[in-house]
């Protein structure tokens, strides 16, 4: 999965000199870009991917640049004109945003400046300087206990729960030794209760990736469509869709000065959390959760339709839509069902329409297996 | 308040160890990298090392690498200094400061001396 | 490594002076450069950070500039707490490395 950048920084620089590019690993949690006639200056937290000085293009004028820090890719790396420059592969630290620092540096200023992260994914246009400098925090230790959660807590502990996903094998890198219904529950709660600016905010991580949306009053108006980005071509799922009807708002409304609702779409590729007895196969190993905040959403009018692009599978195995059940005493694994579910089958996309809200699945079913399926 | 004091200073001779601590107190010890420099009697300031916020990454003066090593426990907000192998010109008052575009908060430094 | 060189190693006035500290060094460090007061039995103390940047409650009689390899430590009016050991360091390349120091003391 292309993961965006945790960090961007673009802006233009007036190049009137033969000029270097420097980066400086700094002990501290701080990045930060510093302009002068001779140089370009890089600070930040992560070793340096050799050599620490360059230089730039020769000619002279106005350069588009751009500084790029991606954790997943544990790369930092700066983008000038057309020329781009690593700074370091090993930049897969989780920073937490603390504040962006006032510039006292004097030097030529940077032009046009912006910055976009995923604590503040709206691109910032910043006024002009000779130098920046975005401090960071460490992730809490530990959780806190009142009643919002740190979007950085919530992070690391996405970031906790996709190393498991990941190698699920390795018992030790579970988050807890909760069953999946309590981690689910628990992330939920996580999501929920998470503080943030806006009205979405999202959270991308290997093996899951969560958005939270904040309910409008007006949101019963419309019928909501979510795309997924596209995924990386050797998946079995390219891309999907939900469409969730505006009937499922209307019902979901606050009374007035109650606190607003919160729509949660959790997009897991991996179905560690979701095993059952019969160790069923998940297209694309794809479970897509669809929550509203402290509401169970079942017998809609109208339905929620998640749609599949997928790769063309064999003849004999049957795709259907299905949705995951816990066990209610939490005593054996949890199964699939299809029950108030459709699905609609075309070579390459499956829809499924279904009734209620839950976490969502295309099983894949040798064709002998189907009728076993619908029994549940 | 923002403090550092070390600990673990004292008479030692020379080939032995010596592990100097330096706890903190009064800001978020794991956000900051953190430094020891030393001080000969009567001498300028010479820097010895420093480790990142994370312990991820150690650089050290070219006259204690192999001899020394910086570590720290977040968790405990303490940074460390093992001594091994000292020698005679070791022998000075061991300041750990914080890393904040320069050195910005120092402890009161502990005084190591090595002799036989 | 890059070698800071102050000047004068002693710098002997009296209290209301002006005092102007030098640092030079051995290839450019941008403006990388910090200056500490040290007094006898003490710590040192943060002073200046990146050549001129004063550091949290210091007074204004202090002031520092230059950039690349020459820099001052300025001390407008001196006063009789003034009077110290003065190093200048620098953080733009490993090692760090520190000047030997200026003694300024009364006249």
């Known amino acids: 999965r292309g993961h965006r950048e945790d960090f961007r920084f673009c802006s233009q620089r007036n190049q009137t000199h033969r000029s270097s590019l420097h980066y400086k690993p700094t002990p501290d949690l701080r990045i930060s870009i510093e302009n002068s006639e001779e140089a370009l200056t890089v600070h930040a937290p992560f070793p340096a991917a050799h050599p620490a000085s360059r230089s730039f293009p020769d000619p002279r004028g106005l350069y588009h640049f751009c500084l790029y820090w991606n954790r997943h890719a544990g790369r930092l790396h700066l983008l000038y004109g057309k020329r781009d420059f690593l700074l370091s592969d090993k930049a897969s630290s989780l920073l937490c945003f603390q504040h962006q620092e006032e510039s006292l540096a004097q030097g030529p200023p940077l032009l046009a400046t912006s910055v976009t992260s995923w604590w503040s994914p709206q691109n910032i246009s910043l006024p002009s300087a000779a130098s920046f400098t975005f401090s960071f925090h460490s992730p809490p230790h530990t959780a806190a206990h009142n009643a919002s959660v740190d979007m950085c807590e919530l992070k690391r502990d996405l970031q906790l729960l996709s190393q498991f996903l990941k190698h699920p094998q390795k018992a030790s890198r579970r988050p807890s030794a909760a069953p999946a219904s309590q981690q689910l529950q628990s992330l939920e709660s996580k999501l929920t209760s998470v503080r943030f600016m806006g009205d979405m905010v999202s959270f991308e991580e290997d093996r899951i990736n969560a958005t939270v949306w904040k309910l409008q009053p007006t949101a019963g108006l419309q019928d909501l469509h979510i795309h997924s980005r596209q995924e990386e071509e050797q998946s079995e799922i390219m891309e999907y869709s939900v469409l969730l009807p505006r009937t499922l708002f209307q019902r979901t409304k606050g009374r007035s000065g109650e606190a607003e609702k919160r729509l949660l779409l959790v997009d897991f590729s991996s179905q560690a959390l979701f095993q059952d007895k019969n160790s069923s196969q998940v297209l694309g190993e794809k479970v897509l959760g669809i929550v509203v905040q402290n509401t169970k959403v079942a017998n809609l009018t109208e339905p929620v339709v998640l749609t599949f692009q997928h790769q063309l599978q064999p003849k004999n195995v049957t795709l259907q839509c299905v949705f995951w059940v816990e066990d209610p005493t939490l005593s054996s694994p949890g199964h699939w069902s299809s029950a108030g579910c459709e699905t609609v089958r075309r070579e390459t996309q499956t829809s499924c329409f279904c009734n209620h809200l839950t976490y969502f699945a295309v099983l894949m079913v040798s064709s002998v297996e189907v009728d076993a399926v619908h029994k549940h | 308040q923002v403090q550092l004091v070390e600990s673990g200073g004292g008479v030692v001779q020379p080939g032995r160890s010596l592990r100097l601590s330096c706890t903190a107190s009064?800001?978020?010890?794991?956000?900051?990298?953190m430094h020891w420099v030393r001080q000969a009697p009567g001498k300028g300031l010479e820097w010895v090392a420093v480790?990142?916020?994370?312990?991820?990454?150690?650089y050290y003066a070219d006259s204690v690498k192999g001899r020394f090593t910086i570590s720290r426990d977040n968790s405990k907000n303490t940074l460390y200094l093992q001594m091994n192998s000292l020698r005679a010109e070791d022998t000075a008052v061991y300041y750990c400061?914080?890393?904040?575009?320069?050195?910005?908060?120092w402890g009161q430094g502990t005084m190591v001396t090595v002799s036989s | 490594e890059i070698v800071l060189a102050q000047s004068p190693a002693t710098l002997s006035l009296s209290p209301g002076e002006r005092a102007t500290l030098s640092c030079r060094a051995s290839?450019?460090?941008?403006?990388?450069l910090a200056w500490y007061q040290q007094k006898p039995g003490q710590a040192p103390r943060l002073l200046i950070y990146?050549?001129?940047n004063r550091a949290t409650g210091i007074p204004a009689r202090f002031s520092g500039s230059g950039s690349g390899t020459a820099f001052t430590l300025t001390i407008s009016s001196l006063e009789p707490e003034d009077f110290a050991v003065y190093y200048c360091?620098?953080?733009?390349?490993?090692?760090?490395?520190f000047g030997q120091g200026t003694r300024l003391e009364i006249k």
């Open positions: 400061a914080r890393h904040l575009d320069s050195f910005d908060i």
């Open positions: 009064g800001f978020t010890f794991s956000t900051y990298g």
């Open positions: 480790i990142w916020y994370d312990g991820s990454n150690k």
């Open positions: 290839q450019s460090i941008s403006s990388y």
């Open positions: 990146d050549a001129f």
């Open positions: 360091q620098q953080r733009d390349y490993w090692p760090i490395t």
